[in-house]
């Protein structure tokens, strides 16, 4: 008889999860020679060890420490790009502006981007049927704890001027409950980070408001300033033009505002 399996509210582990993680690791270390020393089998073993056989609502940051250790990577000062609720544009930007890095441009973020995973207590099986949903089931699930752990580490190691892309189309442009608002903001190190520069990305073509005056941005400024980090904010009125101008900075239309 099939063994009883816990039913969660979220979608199950991404199909072919182990081979996807291993394949991504192999590809990443091949393409990024500075990470060539990484043993992908050890990375997968550490990743697996963080959630396999564990109750999926009781995962801790400690569980991911062996993986974090293996994936240690540093970003040059002034080159960290954080984002909140605007992943696609942030990734399009770093594809073009390669000397800037989002978390998903680093090994561990690259491995897990867009994937879901969880195990079951006391078995070596991966649960492909369902995984805990952050809201409906529990926050200490394997995926949420992973992103919290690697996001904390990413913010802790940032230095110089750190940039963050924020979605100006959302009701809360800065959301204290997002990973950026709850983890990254609080783990930037004032002794290493001189400033945080927010880029507020406008959604509508005709939207000429100064979203840097939004109350949630003022709240972000207050949090950052209290941590002795300077804060700057820029409106990006035309994200399409913004990307085009990153690609072709000499273009005459790029001398005017974006």
């Amino acid at each position: 008889l099939p063994r009883w399996r816990q039913q969660w509210s979220g979608s199950g582990t991404t199909s072919r999860f182990p081979e996807t993680v291993l394949a991504r690791c192999v590809k990443y270390t091949e393409v990024h020679p500075e990470m060539r020393h990484v043993d992908c089998q050890s990375v997968w073993d550490a990743f697996k060890g963080a959630f396999i056989s564990k109750y999926p609502c009781n995962i801790t940051e400690e569980d991911y420490q062996p993986l974090v250790k293996l994936g240690t990577q540093t970003v040059p000062c002034n080159k960290t790009l954080l984002w909140s609720r605007i992943k696609d544009l942030a990734h399009q930007f770093t594809q073009v502006q390669r000397d800037m890095f989002t978390l998903e441009d680093m090994l561990l973020g690259y491995l897990a981007d867009d994937l879901t995973w969880c195990g079951e207590f006391n078995t070596f099986e991966i649960n492909y049927q369902s995984c805990p949903d952050w809201r409906k089931d529990c926050s200490n699930n394997p995926v949420s704890v992973f992103w919290k752990t690697v996001s904390r580490r990413f913010a802790e190691t940032a230095c110089g001027v750190v940039h963050v892309m924020l979605n100006g189309s959302r009701s809360k442009i800065f959301d204290k409950n997002s990973t950026f608002g709850s983890v990254e903001v609080h783990n930037l190190q004032p002794e290493k980070v001189q400033a945080l520069e927010a880029w507020v990305i406008h959604g509508g073509r005709e939207d000429s408001r100064d979203l840097c005056q939004d109350p949630t941005i003022k709240e972000l400024e207050s949090i950052i300033s209290k941590r002795n980090i300077r804060f700057f904010c820029k409106n990006i009125y035309r994200p399409d033009k913004f990307l085009q101008c990153v690609k072709n900075p000499e273009d005459s239309s790029c001398l005017s505002g974006i």
């Epitope: 081979e19 996807t20 394949a23 991504r24 590809k27 990443y28 091949e30 393409v31 990024h32 020679p33 500075e34 770093t94 594809q95 390669r98 000397d99 441009d105 690259y110």
Partner: antibody, heavy 119, light 106 residues
Framework: EVQLQQSGTVLARPGASVKMSCKAS????????MHWVKQRPGQDLEWIGG????????RYNQKFKDKAKLTAVTSTSTAYMELSSLTNEDSAVYYC????????????WGQGTLVTVSA | DIQMTQSPASLSASVGETVTITCRAS??????LAWYQQKQGKSPQLLVY???TLPDGVPSRFSGSGSGTQYSLKINSLQPEDFGTYYC????????FGGGTKLEIK
């Protein structure tokens, strides 16, 4: 703007060697793989190999391991490919092409260098 | 080495039609597949990477799908500028290209 400017057409004798260049501009040369691709007239594309200027890492298609040599001069942001012991089979257009951030596709291409091998 | 088998080798279609080109890899390439368009006498142009991601600037009528060893490129509502030769490429290992699909105006 990313640009890859390749050297001009080459006419060479069988048995000779040729060295073609690919000058890169508009990006940090040392941070991307530079690949080379062969296309014979009216034929398919063939990957020859890739070179990482940041540390001179090189990868070759086994078929071209003894045929092509990939190098680069970082001070001038120029990649080179030398083809040796030329035969008629080497008559083709050769493209230099740059990978994207994680080398998941060849996002930028040079205009191609035509090599004609003829006695 | 992984071989890439592309089909059909040629295809005639009219402006406004939808066409699909397929590519089969001889081994699992883990979604590391790219599609290119090449016009006569020009360099290839990247249309899709990671099997389904469109680079900035590629029209949304192009879409990629597939996984494992089977992949496809779909072009909705063909435009006059879409005619040319299409290649798939395995980006997983050794960057091998498919044999190409020549898309001609009917």
């Amino acid at each position: 703007e990313v640009q890859l400017q390749q050297s001009g057409t080459v006419l060479a004798r069988p048995g000779a060697s040729v060295k073609m260049s690919c000058k890169a501009s508009g990006y940090t040369f040392t941070r991307y793989w530079m690949h080379w691709v062969k296309q014979r007239p009216g034929q398919d594309l063939e990957w020859i190999g890739g070179f990482y200027p940041g540390n001179s890492d090189t990868r070759y298609n086994q078929k071209f391991k003894d045929k092509a040599k990939l190098t680069a001069v970082t001070s001038t942001s120029t990649a080179y490919m030398e083809l040796s012991s030329l035969t008629n089979e080497d008559s083709a257009v050769y493209y230099c092409t740059r990978g994207d951030r994680h080398d998941e596709g060849f996002a930028y291409w040079g205009q191609g260098t035509l090599v004609t091998v003829s006695a | 080495d992984i071989q890439m088998t592309q089909s059909p080798a040629s295809l005639s279609a009219s402006v406004g039609e939808t066409v699909t080109i397929t590519c089969r890899a001889s081994g699992n390439i883990h979604n590391y597949l790219a599609w290119y368009q090449q016009k006569q006498g020009k360099s290839p142009q990247l249309l899709v990477y990671n099997a389904k991601t469109l680079p900035d600037g590629v029209p949304s009528r192009f879409s990629g799908s597939g996984s494992g060893t089977q992949y496809s490129l779909k072009i909705n509502s063909l435009q006059p500028e879409d005619f040319g030769t299409y290649y798939c490429q395995n980006i997983w290992t050794n960057y091998t290209f498919g044999g190409g699909t020549k898309l001609e105006i009917k």
